[in-house]
Amino acid sequence: HNTTVFQGVEGQSLQVSCPYDSMKHWGRRKAWCRQLGEKGPCQRVVSTHNLWLLSFLRRRNGSTAITDDTLGGTLTITLRNLQPHDAGFYQCQSLHGSEADTLRKVLVEVLADPLDHRDAGDLWVPGESESFEDAHVEHSISRSLLEGEIPFPPTS
């Protein structure tokens, strides 16, 4: 799997899309997990509804939401109020039994806010009470890592 890079601006919302073969993954729940190190486990962040016929419904865990278009074959993850600590490697997964197939490997990069909301107290920032529907979603910038690029840079 190549790694696809999605860039979002700090404090804004980032939408990550993971296309998949809807027939190959028919009847399977999906998940979004965070990769802990190059060979470490992928820690589940959020998964789609336990009932596959309700996969369309948005499920949330904190500031992360997931929804699955099972007919179109697109899993969508929204990271709201993006923070520097959200940067890192993730996976979209298709679940079957205790196994998980990787649909897409994702690198989330968090860019500094050019307006720097921290110094602008009168600017609106989505509150915890705001719904995902109301939060403004930036069109994410995405690209695949070039061949030879190292997804997990060696640690010194």
Epitope: S22, W26, L51, L53, F56, L57, R58, L71, S131, E133
Partner: antibody
Framework: QVQLQQSGPGLVKPSQTLSLTCAIS??????????WNWIRQSPSRGLEWLGH?????????EYAVSVKSRITINPDTSKNQFSLQLNSVTPEDTAVYYC??????????????????WGQGTLVTVSS | DIQMTQSPSSLSASVGDRVTITCRAS??????LNWYQQKPGKAPKLLIY???NLQSGVPSRFSGSGSGTDFTLTISSLQPEDFATYYC?????????FGQGTKVEIK
């Protein structure tokens, strides 16, 4: 408007199979934007969701854990209806059985799922 | 399964009264909650979906609120046709469950 019409016997003997049918008018059992449910109601257990079926390129069933080993919900596309079969019934299965359409809310988008159209209900008594 | 507990189990009220029914989930269900009205011998009728959204054709005197574990159905001014039993229902869990019902009777 959408209507659901139920049919089936009101008396079933213990250990036998309960069979009910729900005929749909004004919608299609093959709709990809709905699920077709069976729900029952009894004084002892209240309202209880039993399971649903939906067409998403192929047919897909999901059942409540409490009845999973005994239940089958099937579509009949030629008659635009769906059916419930509950095997090995006991007096505890005595209830009013309802079919219902499950729909997704459009506002707020991707947030709601609800039973908006119900059949008239069928009282099924399990007794010898 | 997620348990849904309604309170009170029954209440007596007069026409014009403001009536509040509560529903508590045994674990957090976000806004995955619907409210239904049922009259004797009839099927339940959808009133509110996704905790606070009024179903089309339902009078505006009905409203819903809440999120997480605690939810409320309010009838702002009770009408004669509102005397019925009301049920909440969650759809977070793989076995969708209903509350035991609240019967609203004439005082």
């Amino acid at each position: 408007q959408v209507q659901l019409q139920q049919s089936g016997p009101g008396l079933v003997k213990p250990s036998q199979t309960l069979s009910l049918t729900c005929a749909i008018s004004g919608d299609s059992v093959s709709s990809s934007s709905a699920a077709w449910n069976w729900i029952r109601q009894s004084p002892s257990r209240g309202l209880e969701w039993l399971g649903h079926i939906g067409y998403r390129s192929k047919w897909y069933n999901e059942y409540a854990v409490s009845v999973k080993s005994r239940i089958t919900i099937n579509p009949d596309t030629s008659k635009n209806q769906f059916s419930l079969q509950l095997n090995s019934v006991t007096p505890e299965d005595t209830a009013v059985y309802y079919c219902a359409r499950g729909m997704y809310g459009s506002v707020p988008y991707k947030e709601g799922y609800y039973f908006d159209i119900w059949g008239q209900g069928t009282l099924v008594t399990v007794s010898s | 399964d997620i348990q849904m507990t309604q309170s009170p189990s029954s209440l007596s009220a007069s026409v014009g009264d403001r009536v509040t029914i509560t529903c508590r989930a045994s674990q957090g269900i976000s806004s995955d909650l619907n409210w239904y009205q049922q009259k004797p011998g009839k099927a339940p009728k959808l009133l509110i979906y996704a905790a606070s959204n009024l179903q089309s054709g339902v009078p505006s005197r009905f409203s819903g609120s809440g999120s997480g574990t605690d939810f409320t159905l309010t009838i702002s001014s009770l009408q004669p046709e509102d005397f019925a039993t009301y049920y909440c229902q969650q759809y977070t869990d793989e076995s969708m469950t209903f509350g035991q019902g609240t019967k609203v009777e004439i005082k």
